[in-house]
């Protein structure tokens, strides 16, 4: 139902990378508009991104406040132009996007190598611990923070001569890894969130090697 | 329900080759590491090597590099153990499984196992 | 690599026995320590992980344990579908390594 000259929103998506989060629709408007109505399951409804003409909505202020929630929104589609203008059912046409869980869903995104050190045939590598917008006491937190030990990192290390990838874990954000002496190693890491069934995995940071201006080399 | 259903096996003369196919249901590969691991006639297992079909990375026991690929193809959801140059002592039957990928459990499910027979 | 060397190979037990099965790593593994089962023309099953947590629906008899760089493998009262093969695998490293194996038989 609804008014000849709008059509309802389809292909609700959500778009979430370390809890910044962005709900996609389409279509393109032609002569119509948009606002976004956003809500926890047990919550009221909270009105975003009025009367755009975009196809997409920055919700990641509302999902931040409690990331365990489980959030669902809508898309109501209006005439540009009337916005007061209702449906036949005396409502305007909406769609409703599929469940949200930000904890569990949001995708993780590419971590970066912070620094590695060598000492002797040890290497200590470190995941820079990105910021996040989820807030707590003002503060903004890290993945870390927020994830606690649900958050692992893969360590992906070889020898710059070989193809063969060894690979490291920890439930922080560094490793300490045994290497071969005299031998130049490049690594990459990867967040992971294994007791996730879907994504689980980041994309992998950008190689490293040694010999690089990332490392520091000490001789013991 | 998760499950991993291998296939491929066969009887294969020394110096033949043989790919062996490593079929999920249940998960998404690239959510996952895969492993293949042997066991030979009477034997204990002998892990062979892991694929990351996320990025590709993978790793070999030594008595199989240069002769074992591990490969992976996400849109059929399956692993792959391509073996080259075969040998009379790489008659086993190969397990692929899953590993869980957190620091404290690995190898969560198995396969049933598909026999490969080296023999002239 | 790291070695992992269990014992004993083969030990034959009665129903409602304890059973210990040892296994030692040639160097420090943390937990990172699992245990399977295996019984003939079936693959592994895990058993126990990081050393001491029991798998999801793995009776509570089978129990594990560390000690710096020793792991125990205890069954408590030994039932007739216990009889099988065990191992021990590490995963602190690549390459995961496993113990040879420890058949348990029927007395």
């Known amino acids: 139902s609804g008014t000849t000259n709008t059509v309802a929103a389809y292909n609700l998506t959500w778009k979430s990378t370390n809890f910044k989060t962005i709900l996609e629709w389409e279509p393109k408007p032609v002569n119509q508009v948009y606002t976004v109505q956003i809500s926890t399951k047990s919550g009221d409804w909270k009105s975003k991104c009025f009367y755009t003409t975009d196809t997409e909505c920055d919700l990641t202020d509302e999902i931040v406040k409690d990331v365990k929630q489980t959030y669902l929104a809508r898309v109501f589609s209006y005439p540009a132009g009337n916005v007061e203008s209702t449906g036949s059912a005396g409502e305007p046409l909406y769609e409703n996007s599929p469940e949200f869980t930000p904890y569990l869903e949001t995708n993780l995104g590419q971590p970066t190598i912070q620094s590695f050190e060598q000492v002797g045939t040890k290497v200590n590598v470190t995941v820079e611990d990105e910021r996040t917008l989820v807030r707590r006491n003002n503060t903004f937190l890290s993945l870390r923070d927020v994830f606690g030990k649900d958050l692992i990192y893969t360590l992906y290390y070889w020898k710059s001569s070989s193809s063969g990838k060894k690979t490291a874990k920890t439930n922080t954000n560094e490793f300490l890894i045994d290497v071969d002496k005299g031998e130049n190693y490049c690594f990459s890491v990867q967040a992971v969130i294994p007791s996730r069934t879907v994504n689980r995995k980041s994309t992998d940071s950008p190689v490293e090697c040694m010999g690089q201006e990332k490392g520091e080399f000490r001789e013991i | 329900e998760v499950q991993l259903v291998e296939s491929g096996g066969g009887l294969v003369q020394p110096g033949g080759s043989l790919r062996l196919s490593c079929a999920a249901s249940g998960f998404t590969i690239s959510d996952y590491w895969i492993h293949w691991v042997r066991q030979a006639p009477g034997k204990g297992l002998e892990w062979v090597g892991y694929?990351?079909?996320?990025?590709?990375?993978?790793y070999y026991a030594d008595s199989v590099k240069g002769r074992f690929t591990i490969s992976a193809d996400t849109s059929k959801n399956t692993a792959y153990l391509q073996m080259n140059s075969l040998r009379a002592e790489d008659t086993a039957v190969y397990y692929c499984?899953?590993?869980?990928?957190?620091?404290?459990?690995?190898?969560?499910?198995w396969g049933q196992g598909t026999l490969v027979t080296v023999s002239s | 690599d790291i070695q992992m060397t269990q014992s004993p190979s083969s030990l034959s037990a009665s129903v409602g026995d304890r059973v210990t099965i040892t296994c030692r790593a040639s160097q420090d593994v943390n937990t990172a320590v699992a245990w399977y089962q295996q019984k003939p023309g079936k693959a592994p099953k895990l058993l126990i992980y990081?050393?001491?947590f029991l798998y999801s629906g793995v009776p509570s008899r089978f129990s594990g344990s560390r000690s710096g760089t020793d792991f125990t493998l205890t069954i408590s009262s030994l039932q007739p579908e216990d009889f099988a093969t065990y191992y021990c695998?590490?995963?602190?490293?690549?390459?995961?390594?496993f113990g040879q194996g420890t058949k348990v038989e029927i007395k």
């Open positions: 695998q590490q995963h602190y490293t690549t390459p995961p390594t």
């Open positions: 990081s050393a001491s």
């Open positions: 694929i990351d079909p996320a990025n590709g990375y993978t």
């Open positions: 499984a899953r590993d869980y990928g957190s620091l404290h459990v690995q190898l969560d499910y």
